[in-house]
């Protein structure tokens, strides 16, 4: 049985792969910061880490997906204060008891050094320095990407 | 109804020590950040410490790093400020204060417990 | 550290008065500024979060203004609960800074 929350990251997900293909993204639109392949919106107002989940969908985007050690140290580049913590778009799973990403992977234990506890409505935040396990319920900004598409020419069948 | 309340002030020797406690009721504790006030007598408001909700992430004043540590309990809802190397300069009443990420206000605060460090 | 910077440190008023208080930073903080009261023995009170914001409970009587480093807090008609020391503090970055504070004391 899935908590509420992994239901919503489950829907939010499904909703996003049944819309249509949009065309590529070539530039970060405004107020978004382009972080190599990606464009990422820092929000300014707090939020439970469902509600950030939510938004970022509203936006025709994901909470931030992170790769690898290096994009993290490159996103938290980009945080300007050690007090400010950001969800991301990982979570606890309680029927799986493994951290999971709301694109269905689970967390490389190698990629993330989380400090706090794996449990029941536990969510991931990052600041400057660290990556920490919050209570979901706590009312922190949020990260939301864009993937940029580099666009490639077709290449049509003569006719 | 949030509620507040700071205990464990009380007249301390310079380079003594003491630990402060706030116990939290009304909401749910550990989804906030909670931070320490301090006021001089006849003085302004000097922020000195913050922590997460879940304890994992802290914050000082330069003027407290190395000698306070802030804490909490959860599970008992409290929050907990142990000082030590006391000086002079910081005797004052010390204030429990929901909030402490950026960019969050204190909106609750507790009624206040007075520190004297003198000999 | 960012300085906050009260204007006037202290003022005599009249209960139904318009009072004004500024804030200054010594650098731009967006909206992120608060302004609290406080009472003689008293732990201080939220007035105005986010610059602007009212909290809930709080007189719609009092106002705040500005963005960047400049700011206003605002009592349209005092009253005699008003007379209080008033604060403002910048939560934009760490160490969260106050003001030395302003004293409306009666006139």
């Known amino acids: 049985q899935k908590s509420s929350i992994e239901k919503c990251s489950v829907d939010i997900q499904q909703s996003r792969n049944k819309t249509t293909e949009r065309p590529g993204l070539l530039n970060c639109p405004i107020y978004w910061q382009q972080l190599r392949e990606k464009c990422l919106l820092f929000s300014h107002t707090v939020n439970p880490w469902n509600n950030s989940l939510a938004d970022c969908s509203t936006k025709e985007s994901s909470l931030l997906l992170i790769r690898d050690k290096d994009e993290l140290i490159h996103t938290q580049n980009l945080i300007r204060d050690k007090a400010i913590l950001f969800w991301i778009g990982l979570n606890f799973s309680l029927s799986e008891k493994n951290w999971k990403w709301i694109n269905g992977s689970f967390l490389n234990s190698n990629d993330l050094e989380i400090r706090g506890d794996a449990k029941e409505n536990s969510c991931i935040s990052i600041s400057q320095t660290s990556v920490y396990s919050e209570y979901c319920s706590t009312e922190i900004r949020w990260i939301c990407q864009k993937e940029l598409t580099p666009v490639r020419n077709k290449v049509y069948p003569d006719s | 109804e949030v509620q507040l309340v700071e205990s464990g002030g009380g007249l301390v020797q310079p380079g003594g020590s003491l630990r402060l406690s706030c116990a939290a009721s009304?909401?749910?504790?550990?989804?906030?950040?909670m931070s320490w006030v301090r006021q001089a007598p006849g003085k302004g408001l000097e922020w000195v410490s913050a922590?997460?909700?879940?304890?994992?992430?802290?914050y000082y004043a330069d003027s407290v790093k190395g000698r306070f540590t802030i804490s909490r309990d959860n599970s008992k809802n409290t929050l907990y400020l142990q000082m030590s190397s006391l000086r002079a300069e910081d005797t004052a009443v010390y204030y429990c204060?929901?909030?402490?990420?950026?960019?969050?206000?204190?909106?609750?605060w507790g009624q206040g417990t007075l520190v004297t460090v003198s000999s | 550290d960012i300085q906050m910077t009260q204007s006037p440190s202290s003022l005599s008023a009249s209960v139904g008065d318009r009072v004004t208080i500024s804030c200054r930073a010594s650098?731009?903080?967006?909206?992120?500024l608060n302004w609290y009261q406080q009472k003689p023995g008293k732990a201080p009170k939220l007035l105005i979060y986010?610059?602007?914001s009212l909290q809930s409970g709080v007189p719609s009587r009092f106002s705040g203004s500005g963005s960047g480093t400049d700011f206003t807090l605002t009592i349209s008609s005092l009253q005699p609960e008003d007379f209080a020391t008033y604060y403002c503090?910048?939560?934009?970055?760490?160490?969260?800074?106050f003001g030395q504070g302003t004293k409306v004391e009666i006139k």
């Open positions: 009304g909401f749910t504790f550990s989804s906030y950040a």
């Open positions: 503090q910048q939560t934009y970055s760490t160490p969260l800074t």
């Open positions: 650098q731009s903080i967006s909206s992120y």
């Open positions: 204060a929901r909030g402490g990420y950026l960019p969050d206000a204190f909106d609750y």
């Open positions: 986010a610059a602007s």
């Open positions: 922590i997460s909700g879940s304890g994992g992430s802290t």
